[in-house]
Amino acid sequence: IVLRPSRVHNSEENTMRALTLKDILNGTFSYKTFFPNWISGQEYLHQSADNNIVLYNIETGQSYTILSNRTMKSVNASNYGLSPDRQFVYLESDYSKLWRYSYTATYYIYDLSNGEFVRGNELPRPIQYLCWSPVGSKLAYVYQNNIYLKQRPGDPPFQITFNGRENKIFNGIPDWVYEEEMLATKYALWWSPNGKFLAYAEFNDTDIPVIAYSYYGDEQYPRTINIPYPKAGAKNPVVRIFIIDTTYPAYVGPQEVPVPAMIASSDYYFSWLTWVTDERVCLQWLKRVQNVSVLSICDFREDWQTWDCPKTQEHIEESRTGWAGGFFVSTPVFSYDAISYYKIFSDKDGYKHIHYIKDTVENAIQITSGKWEAINIFRVTQDSLFYSSNEFEEYPGRRNIYRISIGSYPPSKKCVTCHLRKERCQYYTASFSDYAKYYALVCYGPGIPISTLHDGRTDQEIKILEENKELENALKNIQLPKEEIKKLEVDEITLWYKMILPPQFDRSKKYPLLIQVYGGPCSQSVRSVFAVNWISYLASKEGMVIALVDGRGTAFQGDKLLYAVYRKLGVYEVEDQITAVRKFIEMGFIDEKRIAIWGWSYGGYVSSLALASGTGLFKCGIAVAPVSSWEYYASVYTERFMGLPTKDDNLEHYKNSTVMARAEYFRNVDYLLIHGTADDNVHFQNSAQIAKALVNAQVDFQAMWYSDQNHGLSGLSTNHLYTHMTHFLKQCFSLSD
């Protein structure tokens, strides 16, 4: 149990106050993290509070400003990037968001040697992506869907691709679906380790159906936004991978990397690219039916000037119980021999663990094992492997960092973080310098987050980078809710839950219950992290109990739970929320006449289905930007879990799992439906169809749209949204305003 002390003593009671909605909307209790921008084994850059870019040397203890805030301000820079030879810095300004990761910006190059901006052959604007080579100061950038190369910042550019066209051909950047559902990046180009080669993806969206929606803006006529967006079963992007020699790019030109034959025989995806050496690259491919993944290691053949991907260097990963991987197929981390690698995939017991692959996947050596999961491999050095897992004390919602000594036999395992600040810190990530000489640990909770710097050899803490003292002081007179993380055992299923309880919680009283749900495949809501957010306010000020439950389909507890929802989305996720609610009622402190559920995105889908389950458990609920039919959502995501919406595959469940099919069941609940009209991700179409079905069924409901807002409902819409939802819940629970 993790109890957040409310620090309420009778003598102090009058000085303590509850959280207000204003606190949440103003971000009064937000925390800071410190991620060093590593530039060597012992040096990192950090942007100081006054916006100077400062270089820190851990070993000498010295720091100096490499770029002043005055220079940053001169071009209104919001971001920077130092060239590896430390001669130049790019400054990024005019940030303009596109989708989740993508944005365009204006870039200026500053010459540190003469303290001036590089004049002549300036970069065009706006640029879609820009990056330095890993060595020296070559620049690759994407402008108007084409890739350009500069040998030096002041040089004229060399145009690598010429076929880029808006919404048709994307070079070096992903299209919408690859950005959101496959790569999770704004870029699709990768430098080789020493900058000899540049690999890039070309996405051809010519035949993809287009989603079109109105953007109202301020003009007399709305604009129409068109995005090539493959929904389930639709035509997908065609991807090709090319590599160009950046030393003499005009000679051979881009060379296409061959797709493994077993992948190329039907529709497929490219899932990631990992450089091993300057002349060895590893590509990962995935069949459209996403239960077969192929990892292909390719070598540069100097004599042929081409890339060779021998069948003997193809490694197949297949799932017989679900889809390949977790949310994504994991990526390999290569060892120093440049051919063997470490990778996370399911072991024979159905838990995701680290394996060492030297020749074939069949002969893989399992490095970690147990009824828990390895989550991320951070770094492999010659003698150590650093990874995170949720092994410690069997809490799936924790993350600790471990070191396995791979230089010695048998390998020994050490938990680096488990006992550092045990009460405060149970959920870590890490950031390593070159050769893991030093690393930063960032602890996200359950206590107030703290970032620390450590010696990579001894694991000794060197210094605190950020401890959020101001936040700690600000919270001293706040009545925070209590939090507990526990589990329910139901029909051989373990349901972990987090319960957020009002500060003066009394088990003998009855409280209204709000379920917050996400529930998407391979997600996790029950995590030992710190947060002061809307639900904290609802518990602190409005006296609600809030619960989050990780049911079937959620991650890091083994394949049985994860793959339970395979081809059956919308069934078990809902069942498990309902089961948990029944168990909470049995605990005796829930007012069963005042139970609500809310969720966003996938959570909006689950909350809608839960409200329409016909159980009579829920009085009211809210769906924000919900999916309403899997036929409306992106192919890459949807088909991973649902297969294809065809008669000979899974069309029947696609049809049975819609929210619209259950319109009649909303008659006895209060339903608030919310969506942004410019949602590029879960299209407004989803809520429009729910609303139409409810109208056709003559079912009353409440709705709110946010004009020109996307899936995140940001800015002033956020304030309006949470204020509106608060009023709705307070009305539902008969709480006075």
């Epitope: 052959n121 030096r152 076929n163 003499y248 000679y251």
Partner: antibody, heavy 117, light 108 residues
Framework: EVQLLESGGGLVQPGGSLRLSCAAS????????MSWVRQAPGKGLEWVSA????????YYADSVKGRFTISRDNSKNTLYLQMNSLRAEDTAVYYC??????????WGQGTLVTVSS | EIVLTQSPGTLSLSPGERATLSCRAS???????LAWYQQKPGQAPRLLII???TRATGIPDRFSGSGSGTDFTLTISRLEPEDFAVYYC?????????FGQGTKVEIK
């Protein structure tokens, strides 16, 4: 030994067509970008067209765009240049060269195209 | 397009002398994209220099290249009888690739 052998040149009337071929041997043709470069009698070199290894990228000089088409058959180790709507100013020796946009390291001996009425 | 202007048009020198050929670009060219070729009468061109200064395979070390930006130079340190030919510079920085008009090195 690397060899590039052009063929298909000859005399043609203005407005006519010709198809030049370039047979390659001694290197991995399928992984080499190729170009056509021409030289009018007594004049300098002029790049005409280029094609990437698998034919997905093709480029043309403005003077021939819309009239000439570069292509390749990797199974036959052959490069082609289809020339339509020929004009007197297209008269030149046409070389096929190994390379994309520069560093043309191997050249054929050339084939003469004469456009005249 | 990038225009390359070579000078002089003709260079009359004796064997054993040093030849300095100039190539000026109408706009900046990265060194990586500048090459030099030699062409003898009735023959195809031959690649001499890539990346402004790197000799191609089999090219004797009396040939050297230098320069950057818009000014590039090909130097033949001691002319041999077989070096009398036409020399072309070429850029592959921008499509279309372009050649200079050539410098003829003739026997004085």
């Amino acid at each position: 030994e690397v060899q590039l052998l052009e063929s298909g040149g000859g005399l043609v009337q203005p407005g006519g067509s010709l198809r030049l071929s370039c047979a390659a041997s001694g290197f991995t043709f399928s992984s080499s970008a190729m170009s056509w470069v021409r030289q009018a009698p007594g004049k300098g070199l002029e790049w005409v067209s280029a094609i990437s290894t698998n034919g997905n990228y093709t480029y043309y000089a403005d003077s021939v765009k819309g009239r000439f088409t570069i292509s390749r058959d990797n199974s036959k180790n052959t490069l082609y240049l289809q020339m339509n709507s020929l004009r007197a100013e297209d008269t030149a020796v046409y070389y096929c060269a190994k390379g994309w946009l520069g560093n043309f390291d191997y050249w054929g001996q050339g084939t003469l195209v004469t456009v005249s009425s | 397009e990038i225009v390359l202007t070579q000078s002089p048009g003709t260079l009359s020198l004796s064997p054993g002398e040093r030849a300095t050929l100039s190539c000026r670009a109408s706009q900046s060219v990265s060194r990586s994209y500048l090459a030099w070729y030699q062409q003898k009468p009735g023959q195809a061109p031959r690649l001499l220099i890539i990346g402004a200064s790197t000799r191609a395979t089999g090219i004797p070390d009396r040939f050297s290249g230098s320069g950057s930006g818009t000014d590039f130079t090909l130097t033949i340190s001691r002319l041999e009888p077989e070096d009398f030919a036409v020399y072309y510079c070429q850029q592959g920085q921008v499509i279309p690739p372009t050649f200079g008009q050539g410098t003829k090195v003739e026997i004085k």
